[in-house]
């Protein structure tokens, strides 16, 4: 059987400052068990952008309904984009662990570029 893949179909997204960015991500399977998280950047210094379980992410909303059964769409929207939001965003699947979840597979990343508001 095929192993789960994390698909970020957009290599890059260009958004005007003040607008909303949509970052698309789908998984090809429900298993292995574990959550999806979004990060900006890679490596140990990466910034957590969205984790459904914990944290407060007032600018982030999920594209799919959080109560949808067996959901494999993990796309997010980030509102009120500013130039500081530019960077590469990764959708990352974790395998459930105890006590800590373990990174299983990452999408290829989506580069968010921000176009300044015309003055």
């Amino acid at each position: 059987e095929e192993e789960l893949q994390v698909i970020q179909p957009d290599k890059s997204v260009l958004v005007a400052a003040g607008e909303t960015a949509t970052l698309r991500c789908t998984a090809t399977s429900l298993i292995p068990v574990g959550p999806i998280q979004w990060f900006r950047g890679a490596g140990p210094g990466r910034e957590l952008i969205y984790n459904q379980k914990e944290g407060h992410f007032p600018r982030v909303t999920t594209v799919s309904d959080l109560t949808k059964r067996n959901n494999m769409d993990f796309s997010i929207r980030i509102g009120n984009i500013t130039p500081a939001d530019a960077g590469t965003y990764y959708c990352v699947k974790f395998r459930k662990g105890s006590p800590d979840d373990v990174e299983f597979k990452s999408g290829a990343g989506t580069e968010l570029s921000v176009r300044a508001k015309p003055s």
């Epitope: 059987e1 192993e3 789960l4 399977s29 429900l30 298993i31 292995p32 068990v33 574990g34 959550p35 999806i36 459904q52 379980k53 999920t62 959080l66 109560t67 949808k68 059964r69 067996n70 959901n71 993990f74 395998r95 459930k96 105890s98």
Partner: antibody, heavy 120, light 108 residues
Framework: EVQLLESGGGVVQPGGSLRLSCAAS????????MTWVRQAPGKGLEWVST??????YYADSVKGRFTISRDNSKNTLYLQMNSLRAEDTAVYYC???????????????WGQGTLVTVSS | EIVLTQSPATLSVSPGERATLSCRAS??????LAWYQQKPGQAPRLLIY???IRETGIPARFSGSGSGTEFTLTISSLQSEDFAVYYC??????????FGGGTKVEIK
């Protein structure tokens, strides 16, 4: 129609072994995590074990004694139970996992259960 | 481990009356809570998931509410087939998945 049919229960002496099977039909078995839940006579529900693809999870009370596995080509879930104790006496249910909220599972279909009795 | 405490242990209700069952979690589980019904000699049946979403085919008289640590299952007008044991289950933080001890709804 989703169906789950457990088998393999019976009477076994303390320290003995049993292998339970759960034959699944009516859904894409390989796409879903599966779980064993047990219920001691007259008691409540107790989670035993869950399997995703290669990932397996166990209750502390059975860790090191029970092994969950699956054969996707046969649409079958297994529970190998070794070093059985009197307190393992229960009806064992297999259940299909369902997911919401990006992670975390509940159980939307259950088999009718198979009784395991551990007694000398 | 998250402990779920159900109350009351037994609820005596007359047919047609409302039944209110409580499930309290030892820590925040957000909305990651399910309710099951179990009749004697039968397997559990999923009623509610995500604290308030009715499973397909479950009658509208069953409703779930609450979030965080306090949850309620309400049966608005008890029918004869509703007399059973009801369990809550959390899936926010696992392993282990944990169930409440159950509430038996019996005929008054």
């Amino acid at each position: 129609e989703v169906q789950l049919l457990e088998s393999g229960g019976g009477v076994v002496q303390p320290g003995g072994s049993l292998r339970l099977s759960c034959a699944a039909s009516g859904f894409s078995f390989s796409n879903f995590a599966m779980t064993w839940v047990r219920q001691a006579p007259g008691k409540g529900l107790e989670w035993v074990s869950t399997i995703g693809s290669g990932d397996t999870y166990y209750a502390d009370s059975v860790k090191g004694r029970f092994t969950i596995s699956r054969d996707n080509s046969k649409n079958t879930l297994y529970l190998q139970m070794n070093s059985l104790r009197a307190e393992d006496t229960a009806v064992y249910y297999c259940a299909k996992d369902s997911t919401v909220s990006w992670s975390g599972d509940f159980f939307d279909y259950w088999g009718q259960g198979t009784l395991v009795t551990v007694s000398s | 481990e998250i402990v779920l405490t159900q109350s009351p242990a037994t609820l005596s209700v007359s047919p047609g009356e409302r039944a209110t069952l409580s499930c309290r979690a030892s820590q925040n589980v957000k909305n990651d809570l399910a309710w099951y019904q179990q009749k004697p000699g039968q397997a559990p049946r999923l009623l509610i998931y995500a604290a308030r979403i009715r499973e397909t085919g479950i009658p509208a008289r069953f409703s779930g509410s609450g979030s965080g640590t306090e949850f309620t299952l309400t049966i608005s007008s008890l029918q004869s087939e509703d007399f059973a044991v009801y369990y809550c289950q959390q899936y926010y933080d696992w392993p282990p998945f944990t169930f409440g001890g159950g509430t038996k709804v019996e005929i008054k």
